[in-house]
């Protein structure tokens, strides 16, 4: 659950009167531009671990769309346009907060979830296992 | 607000009926497991565009915790181990959901947010501006 | 229909050059990396080079000193430059096309029926 | 460069009979990003070589459920559960984790 505030107006998220259910206003506060993030920077492109980005679409979900990176290559790319597989691409991950609609199809209700998303790729040092 | 997928029991989400304000059950669904992202790998040292992780904690907000990366170069690091200045380390941002407590220490209400956080970073050729 | 067909090969004399093509039909190159693997008469697969969806590229260090891939999209056919060659060049060359770059597989899906390169004097 | 080997390099296996081969790898063949890219391919008499398994253990479309690939790491194995006359030929193991892509020697499934 949600840790709250310790102060005397807020039950302990222990507390069996600690609610499961809260109220959430769907008002969107925006605390920066919402950019469709293909349009907001063509790092994806001009990265030496370059990613292309798929859509996931799930109108069970809000947000219903969600962009997962996935890395093009194996290897990184060098400043020739050749593929160097003595590196890595790999993806970061990051996990983020979603609502799924519970029950299903219903407007008013939500369960809150965590899912794990790809955001980018980076190009990573890798870790040799030789046999023996 | 959230798009209703269109079917007899949901309202339009344009339609004045449609409810600003939903329930959330707050035992949150995990699709995958919860890691610490300082823990989940070590990308973060690994990559040629190494990043620092920076704890944001906020008490009044769900998730309460978000780390934060910051590239620790301007430029990417070489095999070698060196600096190189003619590629720059850049974050790659990610668009998150948030819940923002609404009344202030209230615990059952809260607001929908949307804030941009650095996931990792990752090595880009830059864009050179020459003086004409 | 996917289909790859290699053209190009032929004798060529020690020192020589040769330029191998493979045309593809049914999909893209701009959608599918394509291999170059070779196989000298009687040995296994051996991995040349690869020019991916993206247009990057990656070879086998031995050989990269002396063979180019390329490809032209607009003609929807993937190139091999061989110069230099030796007689342990005699091979069938294969191109072979990778999975869709939405699959991220690496794996080699469908093989032309190869063109046959003999360097000898 | 990553050395794929074989084994065995012959197999005579009777039709309805079933067969294994392993291929070991000189280094592991888990990619940075925790997959494992090793494939098998067979090349027909006559032929040019044809997809059977990606990725371990996932069979390419078109290709029997008699196939099945398996192994982590290093070890790797393809099983044929009952032999038929058509899968005669030359199996090839493969690694594309690491550049320069590399094949196994083969082996060889011939008919009893």
């Known amino acids: 659950g949600i840790a709250i505030p310790r102060n005397s107006g807020c039950p302990n998220s222990e507390d069996k009167n600690f609610p499961r259910t809260v109220m959430v206003n769907l008002n969107i506060h925006n605390r920066n531009t919402s950019t469709n993030p293909k349009r907001s920077s063509d790092y994806y492109n001009r990265s030496t671990s370059p990613w292309n980005l798929h859509r996931n679409e799930d109108p069970e979900r809000y947000p219903s769309v969600i962009w997962e990176a996935k890395c093009r290559h194996l290897g990184c790319v060098k400043a020739d346009g050749n593929v160097d597989y003595h590196m890595n691409s790999v993806p970061i991950q990051q996990e983020i907060l979603v609502l799924r609609r519970e029950p299903r199809h219903c407007p008013n209700s939500f369960r809150l979830e965590k899912i794990l998303v790809s955001v980018g790729c980076t190009c990573v040092t890798p870790i040799v296992h030789h046999v023996a | 607000g959230i798009a209703i997928p269109r079917n007899s029991g949901c309202p339009n989400s344009e339609d004045k009926n449609f409810p600003r304000t939903v329930m959330v059950n707050l035992n949150i669904h995990n699709r995958n497991t919860s890691t610490n992202p300082k823990r989940s790998s070590d990308y973060y040292n690994r990559s040629t565009s190494p990043w620092n992780l920076h704890r944001n904690e906020d008490p009044e907000r769900y998730p309460s915790v978000i780390w934060e990366a910051k590239c620790r170069h301007l430029g990417c690091v070489k095999a070698d181990g060196n600096v190189d200045y003619h590629m720059n380390s850049v974050p790659i941002q990610q668009e998150i959901l948030v819940l923002r407590r609404e009344p202030r220490h209230c615990p059952n209400s809260f607001r929908l947010e949307k804030i941009l956080v650095s996931v990792g970073c990752t090595c880009v050729t830059p864009i050179v501006h020459h003086v004409a | 229909e996917v289909q790859l067909v290699e053209s190009g090969g032929g004798l060529v004399q020690p020192g020589g050059s040769l330029r191998l093509s493979c045309a593809a039909s049914g999909f893209s190159l701009d959608s599918y990396g394509v291999h170059w693997v070779r196989q000298a008469p009687g040995k296994g697969l051996e991995w040349v080079s690869v020019?991916?969806?993206?247009?990057?590229?990656t070879y086998n260090s031995a050989l990269k000193s002396r063979f180019t891939i390329s490809r032209d999209n607009s003609k929807n056919t993937l190139y091999l430059q061989m110069n230099s060659l030796r007689a342990e060049d005699t091979a069938v060359y294969y191109c072979?096309?990778?999975?869709?770059?939405?699959?991220?597989?690496?794996?080699?899906?469908?093989w032309g029926q190869g063109t046959t390169v003999t360097v000898s004097s | 460069d990553i050395v794929m080997t074989q084994s065995p390099l012959s197999l005579p296996v009777t039709p309805g009979e079933p067969a294994s081969i392993s291929c070991r790898s000189s280094?592991?063949?888990?990619?940075?990003?925790?997959?494992?890219?090793f494939h098998w391919y067979l090349q027909k008499p006559g032929q040019s070589p044809q997809l059977l398994i990606y990725k371990v253990s996932n069979r390419f479309s078109g290709v029997p459920d008699r196939f099945s690939g398996s192994g982590s790491g290093t070890d790797f194995t393809l099983k044929i559960s009952r032999v038929e006359a058509e899968d005669v030929g030359v199996y090839y193991c493969s690694q594309t984790t690491h550049a320069p892509f590399t094949f196994g020697q083969g082996t060889k499934l011939e008919i009893k």
């Open positions: 280094q592991s063949l888990v990619h940075s990003n925790g997959d494992t890219y």
């Open positions: 072979a096309r990778d999975t869709h770059y939405r699959l991220y597989y690496y794996a080699m899906d469908y």
């Open positions: 020019i991916w969806s993206d247009g990057t590229t």
